[in-house]
């Protein structure tokens, strides 16, 4: 099996919702749907992972129901037709209230986590493979929809390049056999992360390009600052970094580390004071010396959202912002397994972030 | 380093409050869920609560369903445990530990705890 | 709720012996099982978080495994540190979603 890379996340999509998963589904991708129950009208929302965008072939069926003391209904259809119904009695979710529904791919399940526990499973009735679409309808507000790829080393080339800063637009996959799309960075000598523009169906017949991180403001999830989370299993080639954010009308300053022990591997430094994007690496509390040369105007710009996206090579760091690439970061500190920690802090609103 | 340190615990009259706090360092708990379990004097451990501040949800065992509550302070870094009528039976030491993290969700155990406070309810 | 049976309560072993600790689910949680160690007087240990998997730090002499709903933490050979009271977990959402097995009390022969 290939690796596909993180595709890039739906954010806030409009409700009913139809989105592409690039490469479909593969054992150990994880998928999570952020939002919020509406407390006002219907009883009913549903994730479904399907085959194309028409809804007759459906291999799982997530559909929370608050009726009759609440319960959740998993089931699969056929070529339109519905197979046997399994319910969970217990409902996890709350009206008016905001969840976390993680999804995770397995050979023989789909396991779901909801709020941060496993919630249930359903064993495959259809193979997996076959999905290449995920729908969200129903009484439900989106925050965002994100991918996370399973660790996997590549059996076979990756992707084709496109030149780092033309972003891709892809219409919906036809049935049949899956056409890979290009990515944004080059495939050698590591598999890429893939950004693209996504092609959304928010209707039936309505079909718009809307960028990956496009410049939105969220409630919630609100991340403390300063942010620092565990990196499992450190760096390593392949392994990507996804982080979108607001930052601050009145911002100076703000910093995203990878850290190992008390060095910081990688200081990513953009100064609205300067109008500059410093990188550095310290070191026993010393820097080193600082690379500032960017190929195109600050991609930051107060007040407005962003999305950045770190990936990691065996050579270097690579380093897009709003699904373009900026810069590439050498690794000063190579013992990639031991920069474990990420920490964000500064003038910014976290909105999302993937490790 | 990750660390959870628990404090308020004490000796508190039957039908009396208690409010546990669970500072968190070394990571937020905004991208984690924090449990507390308890332990009675010589008995076996048993969940009590979970809070999971990304989407503001939370659980309760049935033995505390109505009588505690748990919330989180993601700009303190803290969780808390609200104990309201207690009951004898509540005497324990009440740990706080962290599950998943937000980035590794599919890692099912509680890898960090506190280092407990004693609750003792007696007339 | 999830019943977590776990037995033996209490055993007697020698430094040395294979020590094995079984927690049968009373329905299915697939692979959402941990196993701890306590010593008295300590807050729990992780050994083993998803069933099977070794967390970080904890010797190799420890093991988990899961069939169906029975899982296992199995000690290869007891060492002196490892006399203490083990306890399995699920976390499967349920009306409770955690509950804990009764304890295995390990003590020297």
């Known amino acids: 099996m290939a690796f596909s890379g993180s595709q890039a996340p739906y954010l806030s999509p409009a409700v009913p919702f139809s989105g592409t998963i690039q490469g479909g589904l593969q054992d150990g991708l994880q998928i999570t749907v952020n939002g919020t129950v509406l407390s006002s009208s219907g009883t009913r929302f549903a994730v479904n992972f399907q085959t194309g965008f028409s809804g007759n072939d459906i291999a799982f069926h997530f559909n929370p129901r608050f009726e009759d003391g609440g319960y959740v209904v998993c089931n699969t259809r056929q070529n339109g037709s519905w197979g046997p119904e399994e319910r969970k009695t217990h409902m996890p979710f709350q009206k008016g209230m905001p969840f976390d529904l993680c999804f995770l791919v397995q050979s023989s399940d789909f396991k779901v986590m909801v709020n941060g526990i496993l919630f249930v499973q359903y064993f495959h009735r259809v193979p997996f493979h076959r999905v290449d679409t995920i729908s969200v309808n129903g009484s439900v507000q989106l925050s965002y929809i994100s991918f996370q790829n399973p660790r996997t080393v590549p059996v076979q080339p990756a992707f084709s390049t496109v030149p780092f800063s033309q972003p891709v637009c892809f219409p919906p996959r036809p049935r049949g056999r899956r056409q890979k799309p290009p990515g944004v960075w080059p495939a050698n000598p590591a598999p890429i992360t893939q950004t693209v523009i996504h092609t959304v169906q928010s209707a039936p017949g309505q079909m718009f390009s809307t960028p990956a991180i496009p410049p939105m403001m969220y409630p919630h999830p609100a991340y403390p600052m300063p942010f620092i989370t565990t990196i499992l299993g450190g760096l390593y080639p392949s392994k990507s970094i996804l982080l979108s954010g607001t930052v601050l009308p009145s911002a100076q300053r703000f910093h995203i580390n990878l850290c190992s022990g008390n060095h910081i591997a990688f200081h990513l430094n953009p100064r609205f004071d300067e109008n500059a994007v410093v990188r550095n690496t310290q070191i026993d509390n010393s820097w080193g010396s600082e690379e500032r040369s960017l190929p195109r105007k600050m991609p930051f710009v107060r007040g407005q959202s962003f999305s950045v996206w770190i990936l990691c090579e065996a050579h270097c760091l690579k380093v897009a912002v709003d699904g373009q690439h900026l810069f590439e970061y050498y690794h000063r500190l190579r013992n990639l397994p031991t920069i474990n920690r990420l920490e964000v802090g500064g003038d910014i609103q976290l909105t999302h972030v993937q490790t | 380093e990750v660390q959870l340190v628990e404090s308020g615990g004490g000796l508190v009259q039957p039908g009396g409050s208690l409010r546990l706090s669970c500072a968190a360092s070394g990571f937020t708990v905004s991208s984690s869920s924090i449990h507390w379990v308890r332990q009675a004097p010589g008995k076996g451990l048993e969940w009590v609560a979970y809070?999971?501040?990304?989407?503001?949800?939370?659980s309760y065992a049935d033995s505390v369903k109505g009588r505690f509550t748990i919330s989180a302070d993601t700009s303190k870094n803290t969780a808390y445990l609200q104990m309201n009528s207690l009951r004898a039976e509540d005497t324990a030491v009440y740990y706080c530990?962290?599950?998943?993290?937000?980035?590794?969700?599919?890692?099912?155990?509680?890898?960090?705890w506190g280092q407990g406070t004693l609750v003792t309810v007696s007339s | 709720d999830i019943q977590m049976t776990q037995s033996p309560s209490s055993l007697s072993a020698s430094v040395g012996d294979r020590v094995t600790i079984t927690c049968r689910a009373s329905q299915s949680v697939s692979s959402a099982v941990a196993w701890y160690q306590q010593k008295p007087g300590k807050a729990p240990k992780l050994l083993i978080y998803s069933a099977s998997s070794l967390y970080s730090g904890v010797p190799s002499r420890f093991s988990g495994s899961r069939s169906g709903t029975d899982f296992t933490l199995t000690i290869s050979s007891l060492q002196p540190e490892d006399f203490a009271t083990y306890y399995c977990q699920q976390s499967y959402y349920d009306s409770n979603p955690i509950t804990f097995g009764q304890g295995t009390k390990v003590e020297i022969k």
């Open positions: 530990a962290r599950y998943s993290t937000y980035s590794s969700k599919w890692v099912w155990g509680m890898d960090y």
């Open positions: 809070i999971y501040p990304y989407s503001s949800s939370s």
